[in-house]
Interface confidence: low
Amino acid sequence: SGVFQLQLQEFINERGVLASGRPCEPGCRTFFRVCLKHFQAVVSPGPCTFGTVSTPVLGTNSFAVRDDSSGGGRNPLQLPFNFTWPGTFSLIIEAWHAPGDDLRPEALPPDALISKIAIQGSLAVGQNWLLDEQTSTLTRLRYSYRVICSDNYYGDNCSRLCKKRNDHFGHYVCQPDGNLSCLPGWTGEYCQQPICLSGCHEQNGYCSKPAECLCRPGWQGRLCNECIPHNGCRHGTCSTPWQCTCDEGWGGLFCDQDLNYCTHHSPCKNGATCSNSGQRSYTCTCRPGYTGVDCELELSECDSNPCRNGGSCKDQEDGYHCLCPPGYYGLHCEHSTLSCADSPCFNGGSCRERNQGANYACECPPNFTGSNCEKKVDRCTSNPCANGGQCLNRGPSRMCRCRPGFTGTYCELHVSDCARNPCAHGGTCHDLENGLMCTCPAGFSGRRCEVRTSIDACASSPCFNRATCYTDLSTDTFVCNCPYGFVGSRCEFPVGLPPSFPW
């Protein structure tokens, strides 16, 4: 849609005569009729397909036409069209003499024509006026013309409709070529997408208006770049949402189990060495002369059972003394008067001579210990099973029977239901005491994030007249791209064709 504008500037008819050569009485009271039509190689009579306009009497014989656009819009003359400007045209300008006040064609004598000019050619849409001058034997007409687009129409053919807006459907003004120019803070094909706060994380943050940064589930912080750890996570951090990666020295699902009791609580007394041995458990290795779980008790020197091979210990002021059983001697009854010939090894132990037969050593079979293999080993006395596992003696070995949720030789490993990556589409898995839970990313749902929830707004084919449908990812709405000749949000309205003008 646009307007062909014709600005009449000067008409010269010095002799004041009609086209027939007859003079006007008293002078030629001159008005103009203009016909605009499609391009014709030879301009011929017929309908003014692009429009027609007439002027009132503008002067007598020779006169300049003043620019009167402010006072009623008579000059420049306006020839509006509501179609795509084809780039070519034909123009007929007739100067007529008006003997009276009635300027209708049927009210004029047929020889009232003063002059007639016809031009044709190419004309691009633009602000610049084209100046032209046409001279006949008796007259001269100087005029200029141009084609401009109507409000809200743009492009080389005035065919691009663009209406600035600032609402839910877009936030833009129009560029000279009809392309949208987004208002500050908006982006996207139709400027419907707000530009989030600078630095707002592309995946984890979003916004509904400019300079905002709203966090998706599992994220926090001004720029939505900090993950939210698992609810109840005590001594841990996360790199993805709902994680609880334990700080050094902490364990368990919520990192609330102390794996470094030694450092955090220093339980061992009297210079003992502390060793962590599991969640909230530790072992103190006492210095000589101390005992107790935390080495808090001083002991007599006999408390450390220094006498071997069944010797009995006697406390003395300056230490202790071992009373050895028959067949043994030495400070700790460590030497035997027996030899392998006396078969001193019980329970199938093998005897090995030492010190040229003056001594011996027993090599015990599994499950037996002691100098003479006289003691049966209870492999469960040290309670090796973690996390409440039950210790079972099984012949030469031991075995841990684990509680549900634990595994490993000593039940030391927590079974993770998440180990097999059950959550689809990048869902985050959380171990719970009685199973697992998936936290789904935007656009997915279901127990395992297996259901895609975003819809294809174009699936219902909402666009008419062979228009192309586009889905707007951010809003799950559709946008129709109309072919030439159609407008409307669904391309449902045809652009009107020009009316026919009788000449």
Partner: antibody, heavy 124, light 111 residues
């Protein structure tokens, strides 16, 4: 019509740098992002990086980000890709391509218009 | 080694229907749209399908795309000799701070 015209073929020695240009015409240059993709002989395309001529945002492939820089000169509607410390396995056809959708802040939309490609050969 | 997996070759006779598959993961096809490019010998790739199943203007409706879960496929019906080309799938991948990934390509031969 809308087109991207790239600079001519280059032969470089290992360790050198190359700068490929991509001149846009037929559309408003500052409305669209430009992506750079390379394709070694007989291989599939490999994404290198992207720049928005609209707001200057950039994004690079992690494997190349220490060696590649993409820039634009809006006064001449031209995009540039510079690759430094060239190696023999950088021998490839280098393409520039335009985002399908204008004025997007990140490069998650495909590329609809491609340049004709620039052959870069790295050989001692 | 390409992040998206395509069969290296496919073939069919004129008029036939052929399908090319593209397999990815939750960080690419599972979360983002799939795009298909056609590359004729010695030319730049051409956008064939965008946003899983949309055709740019000028692409015949013989070409169609679909996506399910972490896989996608391109179907060409009424095969013609001019369809002989390399076909690549592509998608945005949000791992490693985000990047585009392509398939290794499928060479389509029209017998």
């Amino acid at each position: 019509q809308v087109q991207l015209v790239q600079s001519g073929a280059e032969v470089k020695k290992p360790g050198a740098s190359v700068k490929v240009s991509c001149k846009a015409s037929g559309y408003t240059f500052t409305n669209y992002g430009i992506t750079w993709v390379r394709q070694a002989p007989g291989q599939g395309p490999e994404w290198m990086g992207w720049i928005s001529a609209y707001n200057g945002n950039t994004n690079y492939a992690q494997k190349l980000q220490d060696r590649v820089t993409v820039t634009t000169d809006t006064s001449t509607s031209t995009a540039y890709m510079e690759l430094r410390s060239l190696r023999s396995d950088d021998t490839a056809v280098y393409y520039c391509a335009r985002d399908r959708v204008p004025r997007i802040p990140v490069t998650t939309e495909a590329f609809d218009i491609w340049g004709q490609g620039t052959m870069v050969t790295v050989s001692s | 080694q390409s992040v998206l997996t395509q069969p290296p070759s496919a073939s069919g006779t004129p008029g036939q229907r052929v399908t090319i598959s593209c397999s990815g993961s939750s960080s690419n096809i599972g979360s983002y749209f799939v795009y298909w490019y056609q590359q004729l010998p010695g030319t730049a790739p051409k956008l064939l399908i965008y946003r899983n199943n949309q055709r740019p203007s000028g692409v015949p409706d013989r070409f169609s795309g679909s996506e399910s879960g972490t896989s996608a496929s391109l179907a060409i019906s009424g095969l013609r000799s001019e369809d002989e080309a390399d076909y690549y799938c592509a998608a945005w991948d949000d791992s490693l701070s985000g990047h585009w990934v392509f398939g290794g390509g499928t060479r389509l031969t029209v017998l």
